[in-house]
């Protein structure tokens, strides 16, 4: 029961995380114009991974895509790559984890196979979350570096006569969305890995012990559940002794988590 809950919760948390990573990647507000002490500005600049936008006090907003690929900074390309890798891994992880969910029955899929898939999706979620966190952090670092550089050169001009105010950029909403989403995906992945450990029952191979009675030679094999210690075990989970306990498979199934997506 706890394993199913952990797995289901891990799936939902990862799903929210990956949706957040996708949202952050698509958002235009990765960097926003620093407004200093002035909350109202006539021209407000903000930039995303794919385009830069300008919002005027008239309400008019104009966005322009970065139509060049080679002309873009290497750091921006790296951030794009990290976010895309994060999304792809997360999407594959979601697909795998759907089939791994205990509350979803697919033919006669064994617990060990589900455990394998749960671990695989968990690892994918962890890597996906790390990619997103890394991508957002690289971009944030780039912003901090540029912020202090532009602060140092805040006013440039010819002989101090003409001032050119350099636009400084600070953290945009997408960065916070990305950090939170990456964290959620990471947590979801860890939960999936934890759930995986409890999915396949522990395989304790007891050696058959022979007890020699005075008369007859009777071999007595102590019963119990075969449990897998590893994730690669493909042995059938045969029950030799049933003392009235129910296996995980016999617990009532709950509405599948993906019904609510």
């Amino acid at each position: 029961m706890a394993v199913t809950a952990c797995q289901g919760l891990g799936f939902v948390v990862s799903l929210i995380g990956i949706a957040g990573i996708i949202a952050a990647t698509c958002m235009d507000q990765w960097s926003t114009q620093d407004l200093y002490n002035n909350p109202v500005t006539a021209v407000f600049n903000y930039q995303g991974l794919w385009r830069s936008c300008v919002r005027e006090s008239s309400g008019f907003t104009e966005c322009r895509g970065y139509f060049t690929l080679l002309g873009l900074p290497a750091m921006l390309q790296a951030v794009r790559a990290l976010m895309i890798v994060g999304i792809v891994l997360g999407a594959i992880g979601l697909l795998v984890s759907i089939f791994a969910l205990k509350c979803i029955r697919i033919g006669s899929m064994e617990d060990s196979a589900k455990a394998n898939m749960t671990l695989t999706s968990g690892i994918m979620f962890i890597v996906s979350g790390l990619c997103a966190i890394a991508g957002v952090s690289v971009f944030a670092n780039m912003l901090v570096t540029n912020f202090w550089m532009s602060t140092a050169n805040m006013y440039t001009g010819m002989g101090g006569m003409v001032q050119t105010v350099q636009t400084r950029y600070t953290f945009g909403a997408a960065l916070f969305v990305g950090w939170v989403a990456g964290g959620l995906t990471l947590i979801g992945g860890v939960m999936m890995c934890i759930a995986c450990r409890g999915l396949a029952p522990e395989e304790t191979n007891y050696k058959a012990v022979s007890y020699h009675a005075s008369g007859h030679s009777v071999a007595y094999k102590p019963g119990g559940f075969k449990a897998s210690t590893g994730f690669g075990s493909n042995t059938k989970n045969k029950k030799i002794y049933d003392g009235g306990a129910r296996t995980e498979d016999e617990v009532q199934s709950y509405p599948s988590k993906h019904d609510y997506v």
Epitope: V43, V54, G59, F60, E62, Q163, T164, T167
Partner: antibody, heavy 115, light 113 residues
Framework: EVQLVESGGGLVQPGGSLRLSCAVS?????MNWVRQAPGKGLEWVAW????????TYADDFKGRFTISRDDSKNTLYLQMNSLRAEDTAVYYC???????????WGQGTLVTVSS | DIQMTQSPSSLSASVGDRVTITCKSS????????????LTWYQQKPGKAPKLLIY???TLESGVPSRFSGSGSGTDYTLTISSLQPEDFATYYC?????????FGQGTKVEIK
Amino acid sequence: EVQLVESGGGLVQPGGSLRLSCAVSGYTFSMNWVRQAPGKGLEWVAWINMYTGEPTYADDFKGRFTISRDDSKNTLYLQMNSLRAEDTAVYYCARTAPGNGFDYWGQGTLVTVSS
Amino acid sequence: DIQMTQSPSSLSASVGDRVTITCKSSQSLLNSGNQKSYLTWYQQKPGKAPKLLIYWASTLESGVPSRFSGSGSGTDYTLTISSLQPEDFATYYCQNAYSFPFTFGQGTKVEIK
């Protein structure tokens, strides 16, 4: 088609108050008040976001003038307090257009501050 | 605040003349985000409200005759009337549309010679 009609101008004594209105028809995201003293140039007074009500003012008018709007009446206001003789001018309301220019203007309302 | 300085303050010209009015700002009006200069030009006739002619330094407002053109970037801008018409005799203002407070130039009065 946007139409702007100002009202509320008139004669007021120094230190007095006056509220100007601008009836707005048509789409406006943000609005401005601009004034022009007799024989002088244009002077921007204040701006307001018609959706959020967020205002900003020219330094000379902060604390004395208040720009506001009434959503239900689709009207823009300029509350002017502590009026001085130098506030005598024609006051225009104007809509902000792309490029932050003012594309639609009212006909103007004259405010005279005199004792 | 950004100061706007127009020159000349007045000029006399004849119909058909090419007229140039310059406007200088104390700070650059060029926005790095979209590479547009936030300078606006207006025409005002006596007793009337100003009329928008040009925004983004060079974009002609709809309905404005093509004889009007704007140019410039950074801190130096120009309004040109290629062939002055009788209805063009008026006062012209430039405006900083880049940052609050919006500021206007003192105006250039175009009179008949």
